[in-house]
């Protein structure tokens, strides 16, 4: 079967109430079939490519475990399994200041060096 291209699927927006939790869905496809090398998953806020990171985790070669390296205020937790092309993120204890746009990103290293980031992101509305 032909190799898939890089793509990312995120909903335009997610709404939740302050104090509650929200899930920011993000799934992706990539052209590197059977890739099991080092992987980094990143979420950033504000703007793509340059906004501040709110979450980052890394998985070693051959591992499904994405070890959290950054979780802003300890409120961000990966629900999705990046090895299954899912970067869905849970945000706990929402505050009005969390009302912004979020962008997911995945990076491959090792034998393959490639990366991709959602351009439009998902808008989190906190009411």
């Amino acid at each position: 079967s032909p190799a898939q291209r890089w793509s990312m699927q995120v909903p335009p927006e997610v709404s939740a109430e302050a104090g509650d939790a929200a899930v920011l869905p993000c799934t992706f496809t990539h052209p590197h079939r059977h890739y099991d090398g080092p992987l980094t998953a990143i979420w950033r806020a504000g703007e793509p490519y340059a906004g501040p990171q709110v979450f980052r985790c890394a998985a070693a070669r051959g591992s499904e475990l994405c070890q959290t390296a950054l979780s802003l205020h300890g409120r961000f937790r990966l629900l999705g399994n990046p090895r299954r092309n899912d970067l869905s993120l849970r945000v706990e204890r929402l505050a009005l200041a969390d009302d912004r746009r979020y962008f997911c990103r995945v990076e491959f290293a090792g034998d393959v060096h490639d990366r991709y980031e959602s351009r439009h992101g998902v808008r989190l509305h906190v009411t």
Epitope: T27, R33, H34, Y35, D36, A60, R61, G62, S63, E64, L65, Q67, L78, L79, G80, N81, R83, R84, N85, D86, S88
Partner: antibody
Amino acid sequence: QVQLVQSGAEVKKPGASVKVSCKASGYTFPRYDVSWVRQAPGQGLEWMGVIHPGSGGTGYNEKFKARATITADTSTSTAYMELSSLRSEDTAVYYCARRGLNKGYWFFDFWGQGTLVTVSS
Amino acid sequence: DIVMTQSPDSLAVSLGERATINCKASQNVGSNVDWYQQKPGQPPKLLIYESTNRYTGVPDRFSGSGSGTDFTLTISSLQAEDVAVYYCMQSNFFPFTFGQGTKVEIK
């Protein structure tokens, strides 16, 4: 051949801790994730958490995060799962399982024989 | 957490007949479902991974299908040694979660 051999049955009192071991052989231990899964008598399977022995990184089911500690000793190819503040509902068979992979697919391909932990006053 | 609901809870099938077990996920889990067989006093044993892939050494009477939220394990011609409890498990989201199990017996 790949083998996971677990420690023997334990009887513990409520409030105590238990530490179950899982000795791996037949493969390169640091390369593969090891998960812990438990099964209460007559019940289904419940994933507790995982360790990547090569990095020592761990991930937990939130349900067990406060009470479970998963570790690994690469020098002896052994994974451990310690569960604290035991209660009667923790009576179960505890399994370790290797997360094998093939062409980018992951699965539990080898399991320990199980360790029965009984919590009773 | 993702809830995996199997149906039926138990199933009695004549030798040589087809057995079908369903598993429904509470949300889309792609094709990331495995099936395990467990016999009394033994650990689970992998049958099917990634919804449709038969694991090494598993007889071809076992097959899996489905994606999204609905998955099926089929035993095309039940043998005596297939009496066991069967579990589906999703690995798309953490924590990994299992179905409650389906007990397969001989009618």
